[in-house]
């Protein structure tokens, strides 16, 4: 969590933005918030990003105003307009590129005063694992599938039954580049399951983890899955 | 307890239509994989198809592939086998099964119904 | 298809004796080999997985052992309710999964 605050000149006010990860080819949101003003027309919204020379996105007097945008921008950003007079100035990012990571500030000004916070977004891909028993293999056999993740992650396997047991030497993980070239889908397999247990395929890398978790008895067989976004500092 | 209970068979013409129902209890049917599995007058058993545990997977044999559709609905906890073209070689006792959970082999069958194709 | 080959196609035993009944693939199959049992008019009943794992409630007397494409099915002391139709099934390589033609387990 950045918490920013006005620079002299008016009265400063409390702008804060919450470090996100964007999933690319997906829309992903900036998050910030900052005190409300009652007049709409006097607020003003200004999201630049380090390293770019124009602006991101600007909301002035009730609606975008764009003339300034970056090329690479053109497009893709909204703010949601309706929840900006009660201090909503989150940014609507479509179509997430790889390049869209950096450093991002949301500046703010109202009739109270002026403030800012800075907002660190990265990108990359990540997915919901689903695990199944691969009753095609030679063996007891579960496969774990997760679709799109980047940069290449991790995958660790672990038992409810076996707990604290390395199942590196009893599992494979391969890695295979999906059509649009960045992007992988995670596939790995584990072998010699047994029955009455319950395994998990954790997947990781710097921006998300993912758990996919399979219950295998002989009258039951449940999956569940799911992904948390690692690095979500608000400040 | 688990229990598979199979009905709609009966004595049909050949060329015709005829769909057999699995009702299944006693366990969490939506996890599993289903089968048929028959038996001709006097031989031995023959699989003939299984589907996925959430439908999106099909198999058959060869001698019925084309023919027939097995089908489920999670919802009502029921197997088919829709067997159209039937044919005078399609009369059995048709059995469903339950796939194991981590291997196709057969812990559970129903008691079968048959099935009669003749003129 | 892998081809599952039961031999004998008949056992006559006597009651107390014990039956030995065979199964071979035609390719390997690793340990995924069932063995069940059918009498007249009833459904088949799973007695063996993995090639040698007992299923749920089934007696110590049934046992099977074999690896790769030859299996093996004894039956240490014959119990009248023994005597019924033995059949393999193959669940390594599918589709098809396939079963043995079965061997009937007589009184001598």
């Known amino acids: 969590l950045i918490i920013g605050f006005g620079i002299s000149g008016r009265h400063s006010i409390t702008v804060t933005t919450v470090a996100s990860a964007g999933n690319i080819g997906e829309d992903g949101i900036l998050s910030c918030t900052f005190e409300p003003d009652i007049k709409l027309s006097d607020i003003v919204i200004q999201w630049l990003k380090e390293g770019v020379i124009g602006l991101v996105h600007e909301f002035k007097e009730g609606k975008d105003e764009l003339s300034e945008q970056d090329e690479m921008f053109r497009g893709r950003t909204a703010v949601f307009a309706d929840q900006v007079i009660v201090g909503n100035a989150s940014l609507r990012l479509k179509n997430v590129q790889l390049t869209d990571a950096g450093t991002y500030k949301c500046y703010i000004i109202t009739s109270k005063g002026k403030g800012n916070a800075n907002l660190e977004y990265k990108t990359g891909a990540f997915s919901m694992p689903e695990v199944n028993v691969d009753y095609n293999a030679s063996s007891e056999t579960l496969r774990c599938e997760a679709p799109r993740w980047f940069p290449q992650p991790t995958v660790v396997w672990a038992s409810q039954v076996d707990q604290g047991a390395n199942f590196s030497e009893v599992s494979n993980t391969s890695f295979e580049l999906n059509s649009e070239n960045v992007t992988m889908k995670v596939v790995s397999v584990l072998y010699n399951v047994t029955i009455n247990n319950t395994y998990s395929c954790m997947i990781e890398n710097d921006i998300a983890k993912a758990t996919g978790d399979i219950k295998v008895t002989e009258s039951e067989i449940k999956r569940r899955s799911h992904l948390q976004l690692l690095n979500s500092k608000a400040s | 307890q688990v229990q598979l209970v199979e009905s709609g068979g009966g004595v049909v013409q050949p060329g015709r239509s005829l769909r057999l129902s699995c009702a299944a209890s006693?366990?969490?049917?939506?996890?599993?994989?289903m089968h048929w599995v028959r038996q001709a007058p006097g031989k031995g058993l023959e699989w003939v198809a299984v589907?996925?545990?959430?439908?999106?997977?099909?198999y058959y044999a060869d001698s019925v592939k084309g023919r027939f559709i097995i089908s489920r609905d999670n919802s009502k906890d029921t197997l088919y086998l829709q067997m159209n073209s039937l044919r005078a070689g399609d009369t059995a006792v048709y059995y469903c099964?339950?796939?194991?959970?981590?291997?196709?082999?057969?812990?559970?069958w129903g008691q079968g119904t048959l099935v009669t194709v003749s003129s | 298809e892998i081809v599952m080959t039961q031999s004998p196609a008949t056992l006559s035993v006597s009651p107390g004796e014990r039956a030995t009944l065979s199964c071979r693939a035609s390719?390997?199959?690793?340990?995924?080999l069932g063995w069940y049992q059918q009498k007249p008019g009833q459904a088949p009943r799973l007695l063996i997985y993995g090639a040698s794992t007992r299923a749920t409630g089934i007696p110590a007397r049934f046992s099977g052992s074999g690896s790769g494409t030859e299996f093996t099915l004894t039956i240490s002391s014959l119990q009248s309710e023994d005597f019924a139709v033995y059949y393999c099934q193959q669940y390594r390589s599918w589709p098809p999964l396939t079963f043995g033609g079965g061997t009937k387990v007589e009184i001598k």
């Open positions: 099964a339950k796939g194991g959970a981590l291997r196709w082999y057969f812990a559970y």
């Open positions: 390719q390997s199959i690793s340990s995924n």
């Open positions: 589907i996925s545990y959430d439908a999106s997977n099909e």
């Open positions: 006693g366990f969490t049917f939506r996890s599993f994989g």
